[in-house]
Interface confidence: low
């Protein structure tokens, strides 16, 4: 029987009346061309909605916008356009919301052609009031807040100037000219690239990387011959041009650019690219594009210094620079990532790793599903997940995979069951154990979201026709109730819930169309009365993450430790609540070969836990560059996985000797760096 329709599915009591009492409609008094929605702060209930409408005239485009504010999670909205003097807001800059709970908002206005600079509207009280400020420059990018101090803003101008404000946009100072890219680092540090000759494009590969730690009082050149740079976790990466040819290599720094090491990654040519897929304070997933227009590359995982890399996954799907990859961090379970590979026959298959890239496997076939037409063997196939690539190819996939850190183990995604991703209409699948096992949750494509830390899952069917029904589940997608939230169906445009999945409110956005009028409308449904009571101890059960063999003493050991979680019982219909904190009990495991990645010069054959020497490096001394000095590596092929906490057990030998030799291959050696002050 279809999911949610078997006899054991209990109905949630009186949910129609409860949801009816908690369904709030807001009809916006206009239909604007686009709607953008931003949450201001965490748990504040404040939402800003900007509707914009472009009126194309013969010579120019005239714009109008309206700004609405809610302070009750979208149940009611107030038109606050007058607070911004009815000014047209530029949607390409969006609404710049300050970090954490600063309550800061910056809106960038459209100004007439001949003006000296742009205009912004600033609020530091969760958009209750705005201050208009005229800028001494025309912004090219959205204002960027320092993560450490929301009063510090940076922006690039259309003239490629780097502008900084120390008082939340009240006064601005140009700290550098000829800037291509600027980013905040930690401790209010700004990293930026500059060009010397023509332009950013002309000087690509000849850019300089600069750093200022005092908001532009003094500067340090920390890199030359730069193609691009990026920040990930505690790592600073620079893509640097080689001296002799057009290839470039990744260099990495863990001290804000004071010293650099060349990453042991293949160099790339002009048409290729590097991409940081994911990074944390322990390690980095790096994609290195294959030569030629293949649409794939190789994933490498780093050591704890970001220098030595192991090949993690071949034929990783990643179309072009800035293109599409399906790489997804499953945030609901430690160590889990999902992505797609391009097979030799050009079909696309989904792979999953449970140990941070150590080993990749296919997704287990859901028990309640049959293999589709792509399967050669109708009894043996896998689940394949639709993500960014499928969406970019305009397949009938309304949403990418979804997981939330506080909804432990839950992953929801569109997929098909076969030997590869299918272009047929997908269904929605759910895993409640971080991707080990899957179940078909809903037939056909849907929008979905997680509320109350997993206590409720909400879904809306993806349809070209107007809709008026929402589905919800209180048991992690096993059983579904449907609720008609409006008599008059609406053309659905999106589901919105507060980031973090702690809320119990969901907003359904769309527009109504009748003969004469077209209006944006939102329905906010509060599920608080469905989950009538607060969860108690008895509502939770102990769950061992990554458990695959309960008989095994080491069951659940991933990255050197196992974790037991307190998880809500599927049968419990209660509120985790906004203050819910995931309860977990870690315990250290004995080391095994699974706790080690293959060291530089070694690789792991498929389905083998042993690391063997790369044939091309057999008999060679393993030497590599570290902080501009040549190092000699003595290894039997293993290095501990970054973040692995195992103790005892297997302990492979690994020793690094300083050869006291300078590396000629390191373009970012310290003596090439210089400092200057303003």
């Amino acid at each position: 029987s279809a999911p949610g329709e078997d006899e054991e599915c209990g109905r949630v009591r009186d949910f129609v009346a409860k949801l009816a009492n908690n369904t709030h409609q807001h009809v916006f008094d206009d239909l604007r061309g686009s709607v953008s929605l931003s949450w201001v702060g965490d748990s504040t209930g404040v939402i800003l909605v900007l509707t914009t409408f472009h009126v194309p005239l013969v010579i120019m485009t005239f714009g109008q916008s309206k700004l609405y504010r809610s302070e009750d999670y979208g149940k009611n909205f107030k038109d606050i356009t007058d607070l911004i003097n009815n000014t047209f807001i530029r949607t390409e800059f969006g609404m710049a919301i300050g970090p954490e709970n600063s309550g800061k908002v910056v809106l960038t206005a459209e100004v007439s052609g001949g003006s000296r600079g742009g205009r912004i509207f600033r609020s530091s009280d969760f958009a209750k009031n705005f201050v208009q400020t005229d800028l001494p420059f025309h912004p090219l990018t959205q204002m960027m807040y320092s993560p450490q101090n929301s009063d510090y803003l940076l922006a690039l101008s259309t003239e490629n100037g780097l502008w900084v404000s120390k008082n939340f946009g009240g006064k601005w100072e140009e700290i550098h000219k000829a800037v291509c890219l600027a980013k905040w680092g930690s401790d209010n540090t700004i990293f930026f690239t500059t060009y010397a000759n023509g332009s950013c494009k002309a000087d690509l590969g000849a850019l300089e990387l600069w750093r200022t730690s005092d908001l532009g009082k003094s500067f340090k050149t920390i890199g030359v011959k730069i193609y691009s740079f990026g920040l990930g976790g505690r790592f600073l990466f620079a893509s640097v041009m080689a001296d002799k040819d057009t290839t470039r290599r990744i260099h990495v720094s863990t001290d804000q650019g004071d010293t650099w090491s060349m990453a042991q990654l293949p160099s790339v040519g002009q048409e290729q690219f590097y991409s940081i897929l994911a990074a944390n304070d322990d390690m980095v997933f790096m994609h290195v594009d294959e030569p030629g227009d293949t649409g794939f590359g190789t994933i490498f995982t780093s050591d704890d210094r970001g220098i030595v890399y192991s090949k993690s996954l071949d034929r990783h799907l990643y179309t072009t620079t800035g293109g599409e990859t399906d790489f997804t961090n499953v945030t609901s379970l430690r160590g889990v990532y999902i992505t797609s590979v391009l097979s030799e026959d050009n079909s696309i298959q989904t792979m999953i790793t449970f140990d941070q890239g150590g080993r990749w496997t296919h997704l287990r076939k859901p028990e309640n599903s049959e293999c589709d037409a792509t399967a050669k063997n109708k009894n043996e196939c896998s689940l394949h997940i639709h993500a960014s690539y499928s969406i970019s190819q305009k397949l009938n996939v309304p949403m990418a995979p979804l997981s939330e850190p506080n909804a432990v183990g839950i992953v929801i995604a569109h997929g098909s069951v076969g030997d590869a991703i299918s272009v047929m209409v997908p269904d929605v699948y759910i895993s409640d154990d971080g991707g080990y096992s899957w179940t078909k949750m809903l037939e056909g494509p849907h929008y979905y979201t997680i509320l109350d830390s997993g206590g409720i899952i909400v879904a809306i069917e993806h349809s070209s026709r107007p809709i008026n029904v929402i589905k919800f589940s209180t048991d992690e997608g096993q059983c579904w109730q449907t609720y008609t939230f409006t008599r008059d169906p609406i053309y659905f445009t999106g589901l919105a819930s507060e980031p973090g999945a702690r809320s119990m409110n969901i907003s359904i956005w769309g527009f109504t169309e009748s003969f004469l009028t077209s209006q944006w409308v939102s329905y906010t449904i509060d599920f608080k009365d469905i989950l009538e009571r607060n969860c108690e101890e008895k509502d939770y059960t102990i769950w061992l993450a990554h458990s695959t063999d309960p008989e095994d003493y080491e069951d659940g050991c991933i990255l050197g430790y196992k974790e037991q979680f307190l998880r809500l019982r599927k049968s419990s219909v209660c509120q985790n609540g906004r203050d819910y904190v995931v309860t977990k009990q870690p315990s250290i495991c004995l080391c095994s070969l699974e706790d080690f990645l293959c060291d530089f010069g070694y690789y792991r054959p498929e389905n083998d836990s042993k690391c063997v020497e790369q044939p091309e490096l057999k008999g060679h001394d393993l030497e590599f560059c570290l902080y501009g000095r040549e190092e000699h590596l003595t290894t039997n092929g293993y290095r501990k996985i970054p973040g692995d906490k195992c103790q005892g057990g297997v302990n492979p030998v690994r020793e690094v000797k300083d050869l006291k030799k300078k590396c000629t291959s390191n373009f970012l050696s310290p003596e090439k760096q210089n400092s200057k002050s303003n």
Epitope: R13, D14, V16, A17, K18, L19, A20, N21, T23, H24, Q25, V27, N468, T482, Y483, T484, F485, T486, R487, D488, T512, V521, Y523, D529
Partner: antibody, heavy 124, light 106 residues
Amino acid sequence: QVQLVQSGAEVKKPGSSVKVSCKASGGTFSSYAISWVRQAPGQGLEWMGGIIPSFGTASYAQKFQGRVTITADESTSTAYMELSSLRSEDTAVYYCARQGRKTGYYYYYGMDVWGQGTTVTVSS
Amino acid sequence: DIQMTQSPSTLSASVGDRVTITCRASQSISSWLAWYQQKPGKAPKLLIYKASSLESGVPSRFSGSGSGTEFTLTISSLQPDDFATYYCQQADGHITFGGGTKVEIK
């Protein structure tokens, strides 16, 4: 102006069933909840159950669970209440009432439109 | 189910009097309470919804207040047309009515 018109009075034998209809006219029917409320002679009001026609799923008071069935036919804008295994205590006036007032969404605004009532007498 | 207790069950008053009827819920029902007026042989009529919102067409002498478990219907100045039976009704979960308060002429 919405009106709810109920079927005529019924006299029934104990153990039998009765089905009362409630037809909406002059307004929308589907988006509202229709409740059934009864009132025994000289007694107070007692909610039996209700349905949102466009939704189709009925909700019943525990006391009547298993004995009452509430349905709705959107095409004729009619709601029905069937009570089985009648006993003399079921002698009462049965009302249908509309609840929910805002077009476009449901919200509990009380039962704002009532039918004229149908008298059901259970007697042997 | 939630029980609704209305008091008093009978109330004698004169025209012009200020009349107060109380309704207590066995557990919190937020503001999901309505008040009705019923005259003999007639269907009930909605007066107040959501504890304090006056139904359109209802005279302003009727007002409702309260939330959680304690609710009050007040008729500020009793008129001849107001002699009737009044019911409270909760809508948090299954619907239940109070036992009724009969307002009669003193």
